[in-house]
């Protein structure tokens, strides 16, 4: 028996479906036991055993074309390895498998922000944005007055009075020294390949000590 | 933390068997493969195959159908491998060695196979 | 079966050099390919899984990178405890697989 697949790394996006693709190219065997594993760090279940969908995928999968598996509903948690075997008694090469690894795409939720109220002039200043369901990682991106903000505001001309810098992949943004032009409304936003959430609007207001 | 303790050494006689386990602890055992791997000096390691204590399933490498035998017990998560027909051929270290990755191996069993 | 050709079989380093040692594989194995390291008398320790990930305690000296039929294992500063065999392994598909083992000494 040789099998093939037509997608060995499948991405689908949560609650969507998706087909794992598992093809007999040749066998002489009429009848091959087909069992499809799931291993998740190293830990292995039985999702189709006994010709019978178990484990966490009862009621939300099925066996297409005598071999492949369609899941539907997809979770999170069904991000992982899936071996697909088969033996084939009356064949040469009675056994063959391959392994498929399935990711899962989470949105991103509305991520948590925290804008400080009101800072003095030259001090420094940190906003910070987090999320923490979407998969993959998303990059965040800070808002000000619905103005994006470049990385790092040397780069742009239009920052000059401006001394920040933006860490996309923590999503903190950082004013060494915040100036006058700095107070307005601030918010962020969390993206990834699935999908994209902000935060509400908050105020910094940027004043004088005298 | 995740232990795999091996029985001791064996010294056989050609044409018996042989049975020799592997004792599982800091982790649940039902719920990874348990592999098993020959050593021998100058042939490097060759995998024998796997057991899934879950549900007893077995995958065997062709060239150890007939020779080798695996199973598991679930109340005392220990896994034994069952090895017949011996001949100095047979003369190895029998690793047991956990999980689809092979991530953690038992001390080895010595298998001797003399008259 | 999957042929998994490892090489070299010794190897003979200084303490501070970078070491590396490869595996080919007959076919295509999809990055399942993991190494490992053996001390005389001693059962096998995973280094690297999957290629590239390094398992968890394993000092960061060791690394791995491959895809396909290629694969590498590099040392990037040969310390005298790492005197010892590797091995690399495929587990993608049909028997399991091991190379032949690199014999490592300082």
């Known amino acids: 028996v040789n099998l093939k697949s037509s997608n060995r790394t499948p991405v689908v996006q949560e609650f969507e479906s998706v087909e794992l693709s598992c093809i007999i190219t040749d066998s002489q065997t009429s009848d091959p036991r087909i069992e499809w594993k799931k291993i998740q760090d190293e830990q292995t279940t039985y999702v189709f055993f006994d010709n019978k969908i178990q484990g966490d995928l009862a009621g939300r999968a099925e066996i297409l074309g005598k071999t492949s598996l369609k899941i539907w509903n997809v979770t999170r948690r069904d991000s992982a390895l899936y071996r697909c075997e088969v033996v084939a008694r009356n064949d040469r090469k009675e056994i063959d498998e391959i392994v498929i690894e399935l990711t899962v795409q989470v949105k991103p939720v509305t991520p948590v922000c925290r804008v400080p109220k009101a800072v003095p002039v030259g001090k420094m200043a940190t906003l910070h944005c987090q999320e923490s369901e979407g998969h993959p990682r998303p990059h965040y991106s800070w808002y000000r007055n619905d103005v994006p903000l470049p990385t790092d505001s040397r780069a742009n001309p239009r920052f000059r009075n401006s001394s920040f810098h933006l860490n996309s992949e923590t999503g903190t943004l950082v004013f060494t020294a915040v100036h006058k032009d700095d107070s307005g409304q601030y918010y962020c936003i969390a993206s990834n390949d699935a999908g994209s959430a902000r935060c509400e609007e908050q105020e910094m207001e940027v004043y004088d000590l005298n | 933390q995740v232990q795999l303790q091996q029985s001791g050494a064996e010294l056989v006689k050609p044409g018996s068997s042989v049975k020799i386990s592997c004792k599982a602890s800091?982790?649940?055992?039902?719920?990874?493969?348990m592999h098993w791997i020959k050593q021998q000096p100058g042939n490097g390691l060759e995998w024998i195959g796997w057991?899934?204590?879950?549900?007893?399933?077995?995958r065997y490498n062709q060239k150890f159908n007939g020779k080798a035998t695996l199973t598991a017990d679930k109340s005392s998560s220990t896994a034994h491998m069952q090895l017949g027909s011996l001949t100095s051929e047979d003369s190895a270290v029998y690793f047991c060695?956990?999980?689809?990755?092979?991530?953690?191996w038992g001390q080895g069993v010595m298998v001797t196979v003399s008259s | 079966d999957i042929q998994m050709t490892q090489s070299p079989s010794f190897l003979s380093a200084s303490v501070g050099d970078r070491v590396t040692i490869t595996c080919k594989a007959s076919?295509?194995?999809?990055?399942?390919l993991n190494w490992y390291q053996q001390k005389l008398g001693e059962a096998p320790k995973r280094l690297i899984y999957?290629?590239?990930s390094l398992q968890t305690g394993i000092p960061s000296r060791f690394s791995g990178s491959g895809s396909g039929t290629d694969y590498t294992l590099t040392i990037s500063s040969l310390q005298p405890e790492d005197v010892a065999t590797y091995f690399c392994?495929?587990?993608?598909?049909?028997?399991?697989?091991f190379g032949g083992g690199t014999k490592l000494e300082i």
């Open positions: 057991i899934y204590p879950g549900n007893g399933n077995t």
């Open positions: 392994f495929q587990y993608n598909s049909g028997p399991r697989t």
């Open positions: 060695a956990r999980g689809d990755g092979v991530d953690y």
């Open positions: 800091g982790y649940t055992f039902t719920s990874y493969d």
């Open positions: 999957k290629t590239n």
């Open positions: 076919q295509n194995i999809n990055k399942y």
